[in-house]
């Protein structure tokens, strides 16, 4: 349907493919791509070659190509400013001549290894109350955090560490729509030096 918007996730500096999925390539005469401005025109190549792309905006020069036979569009070397709405006006021999496909391109950084910050809050009867905070280097959008083995969600984990839990390893997994990465801390490290009281510990 013309009204549907297809979300496409891309990774900063890498490539993304807009799925046009033309079923009958012979039908296609031209596809006009627009975003904030005109982006490119795609026309059929010779019978055995990929479609021909004419880039119409300097921001996209040498970064766009189209794949045969389905006319999927590829933007490479993605930049943050590439994010936004895209429209493909597909002109074919079939009625109604021109149909429109709409896309929303979201661009994310590939997540680096997260850091676990440890804060010892209190220690009573060989049980210590520890807060673990997991964070990625740059403040990123759409990042979710998960802790194992507890299955807790969110970037902050509060634990009450007992001697029996010494063999546990706590792993934080940070995830966004295009990547995930993890860091771990062993339970032994958490309350190793109670005498020092409150402290912050960075792993990695």
């Amino acid at each position: 349907k013309d009204s549907e918007i297809f979300t496409v996730n891309g990774i900063l500096g890498e490539s993304v493919t807009f799925p046009v999925n033309i079923q009958e390539p012979r039908q296609v005469k031209i596809i006009a791509w627009t975003s904030k401005t005109s982006v490119a025109y795609v026309t059929p190549g010779d019978s055995e070659t990929a479609p021909v792309v004419t880039v119409t905006h300097r921001n996209y020069y040498e970064r766009i190509h189209a794949l045969g036979p389905n006319y999927n569009l590829v933007i490479s070397d993605l930049r943050m400013e590439d994010a936004g709405d895209y429209k493909a006006d597909i002109n074919t021999q079939a009625d109604p001549y021109t149909t429109t496909k709409r896309y929303n391109l979201q661009i994310y950084r590939r997540l680096g290894k997260p850091k676990i910050t440890q804060s010892l809050m209190a220690s009573v009867n060989s049980t210590c109350n520890v807060t673990l905070t997991c964070s990625v280097e740059k403040e990123e959008k759409n990042v979710t955090y998960n802790w194992s083995p507890l299955g807790e969600e969110g970037n902050v984990l509060q634990i009450f560490q007992t001697p029996e839990d010494q063999e546990l390893t706590y792993t934080c997994t940070a995830q966004n729509p295009v990547s995930n990465n993890s860091d771990s801390i062993s339970a032994r490290q958490l309350c190793a030096d109670i005498a020092m009281g409150f402290r912050t510990h960075h792993t990695g």
């Epitope: 079923q23 009958e24 012979r26 005469k29 025109y41 001549y97």
Partner: antibody, heavy 116, light 111 residues
Framework: QVQLQQPGAEVVQPGTSVKLSCKAS?????NYWINWVKLRPGQGLEW???????????NYNEKFKRKATLTVDTSSSTGNMQLSSLASEDSALYYC?????????WGQGTLVTVSA | DIVLTQSPASLAVSLGQRATISCRAS??????????MHWYQQKPGQPPKLLIK???NLESGVPARFSGSGSGTDFTLNIHPVEEEDTATYYC?????????FGGGTKLEIK
Amino acid sequence: QVQLQQPGAEVVQPGTSVKLSCKASGYNFTNYWINWVKLRPGQGLEWIGDIYPVSGTTNYNEKFKRKATLTVDTSSSTGNMQLSSLASEDSALYYCASGTGRFAYWGQGTLVTVSA
Amino acid sequence: DIVLTQSPASLAVSLGQRATISCRASQSVSTSSYSYMHWYQQKPGQPPKLLIKFASNLESGVPARFSGSGSGTDFTLNIHPVEEEDTATYYCQHSWEIPYTFGGGTKLEIK
């Protein structure tokens, strides 16, 4: 309703050029390719080329590549075809037609006569 | 370029009978989904009129006595029953590739 308006006739001298026009109305001009077709008595129909108004993208029949130049003026919804270095064999009826691959709408044609 | 050969070059058919016009392409103009062949009618002093698109699909407003068939390289236009007003020249045209080409035309006369 859809209309493609063409001048009725042009009389031109050999070696000169002529610019034929095709004014479209009654439909979204940008969505349809403007095609040009040549008709000579006893020779049938020949497709010259087409142009897409949105982008100015053109396709030409190799036979007419040096003879015809297609342009559009989207502000006036007009397609144009310039014929250069005119000779007697260019005397013909020239139609514009709109459509993608097939031609649903036609102008009445412009009769070009090349005569000294 | 794809050459379209129409036959016969002319034919005369009695009123109410069937007229059959053939168009043969020098190479296939069909995929598994579509045949890229179209038919036009041209009357004297008028531009061509699209009758049939994609080998067998009747264009809007065209009488049902016109029908098209065929695929690959062989296509047929049938008119049945023919009427007086069907006196015209009929052309086939492919849109398989650039350049589009037309057949040489078939002149139909009603007896």
